[in-house]
């Protein structure tokens, strides 16, 4: 599965779009800063196998896609940029899905390290609750946008796993 090239290209494009989506100066939102605790240490301390890396990256992108697909998100961002960003994520999901099926085989689903999936889910739970608590304010969305950009950059260890031959 020739994922690394296409994935990193799409990942870069998504990050550029996410950067362009910024509407407010981050300095005007300093009071809204929040520690979301991306599970960086867990990821960095682990040597991911390819199938594991694909599953965890898929979960991260799927949760990001869901987050930016809500009505509240539509109201917060410039529509054409949001659509381009969502399309980019959707394509990444397609790439990763194709790889899961190719790596695993259609019928068989091996055990994966569910704790990493759960760590990603909990991280996005914290983001979701933060947005709700802040009533989806423009500053809250700006904080989340910056956080997602960071998390995309953090997942380098996962991307190393993509290049590994299981």
């Amino acid at each position: 599965c020739d994922l690394p090239q296409t994935h990193s290209l799409r990942n870069r494009r998504a990050l550029i779009l996410l950067a362009q989506m910024g509407r407010i100066s981050p300095f005007s939102c300093l009071k809204d800063r929040h520690e979301f605790r991306f599970p960086e240490e867990e990821f960095d301390g682990h040597q991911f196998q390819k199938t594991q890396a694909i599953s965890v990256l898929h979960e991260m992108i799927q949760q990001t896609f869901n987050l930016f697909s809500t009505e509240d998100s539509s109201a917060a961002w410039e529509q054409s940029l949001l659509e381009k960003f969502s399309t980019e994520l959707y394509q990444q999901l397609n790439d990763l899905e194709a790889c899961v099926i190719q790596e695993v085989g259609v019928e068989e689903t091996p055990l994966m390290n569910e704790d990493f999936i759960l760590a990603v889910r909990k991280y996005f739970q914290r983001i979701t609750l933060y947005l709700m608590e802040k009533k989806y304010s423009p500053c809250a969305w700006e904080v989340v946008r910056a956080e997602i950009m960071r998390s995309f950059s953090f997942s380098t260890n996962l991307k190393k796993g993509l290049r590994r031959k299981d």
Epitope: Q125, R126, L129
Partner: antibody, heavy 119, light 108 residues
Framework: QVQLVQSGAEVKKPGASVKVSCKAS????????MHWVRQAPGQGLEWMGE????????IYAQKFQGRVTMTRDTSTSTVYMELSSLRSEDTAVYYC????????????WGQGTLVTVSS | EIVLTQSPATLSLSPGERATLSCSAG???????LYWYQQKPGQAPRLLIY???NLASGIPARFSGSGSGTDFTLTISSLEPEDFAVYYC?????????FGQGTKLEIK
């Protein structure tokens, strides 16, 4: 609106297998993990496992590992839960419940499917 | 496995009274991942409270939740006839996800 519609009641003999379906509508099927929870008569709720409809990966509770198989058909937005080597203790109502985050976690449930295991 | 123990098993109260239901976890649960469900006979469970203290959509304000770590509480300030049901706490803080055994709230 989100709807989860399950297949009808089943009566099975000990040792047999049962396959329960859960058809989803009203949302993008591939975007949310689907869970299975069961409830024996007069008893509490028990989580069995979950499936990601997008690529089919599963996570099962240790208790059901080796006996349960969760699958999905993206063309019909349906997930399936198959339980094999049935015994009388497996008599229960089986529910599918959609995952999500915040207020969406298990906010949507199927109506339940009664599986009776009896000789 | 995180065992959730609910108490009391049965609570007999009259409409208008205050109900306090407890859920004790065998090990610490992140408050973000502690939920409460209500179930009536012949029905699927219904989400009441998410993340310990947040009311789900359409749930009346007489319901409230609190707690942290290993001890969580569901409170119904003034019971209405439709509140008599079984209540379950649930955690998805670690695998396998678990539910309490339930508290049956019955009319005295």
């Amino acid at each position: 609106q989100v709807q989860l519609v399950q297949s009808g009641a089943e009566v099975k003999k000990p040792g047999a297998s049962v396959k329960v379906s859960c058809k989803a509508s009203g949302y993008t099927f591939r975007n949310y993990w689907m869970h299975w929870v069961r409830q024996a008569p007069g008893q509490g709720l028990e989580w069995m496992g979950e499936i990601n409809p997008s690529h089919g990966r599963t996570i099962y509770a240790q208790k059901f590992q080796g006996r349960v198989t969760m699958t999905r058909d993206t063309s019909t937005s349906t997930v399936y839960m198959e339980l094999s080597s049935l015994r009388s203790e497996d008599t229960a109502v089986y529910y599918c419940a959609r995952g999500g985050l915040g207020p969406a976690w298990f906010a949507y449930w199927g109506q339940g499917t009664l599986v009776t295991v009896s000789s | 496995e995180i065992v959730l123990t609910q108490s009391p098993a049965t609570l007999s109260l009259s409409p208008g009274e205050r109900a306090t239901l407890s859920c004790s976890a065998g090990s610490s649960v992140d408050s973000s991942e502690l939920y409460w469900y209500q179930q009536k006979p012949g029905q699927a469970p219904r989400l009441l409270i998410y993340s310990t203290s947040n009311l789900a959509s359409g749930i009346p304000a007489r319901f409230s939740g609190s707690g942290s770590g290993t001890d969580f509480t569901l409170t119904i300030s003034s019971l209405e006839p439709e509140d008599f049901a079984v209540y379950y706490c649930h955690q998805w803080s670690s695998y396998p996800f678990t539910f309490g055994q339930g508290t049956k709230l019955e009319i005295k």
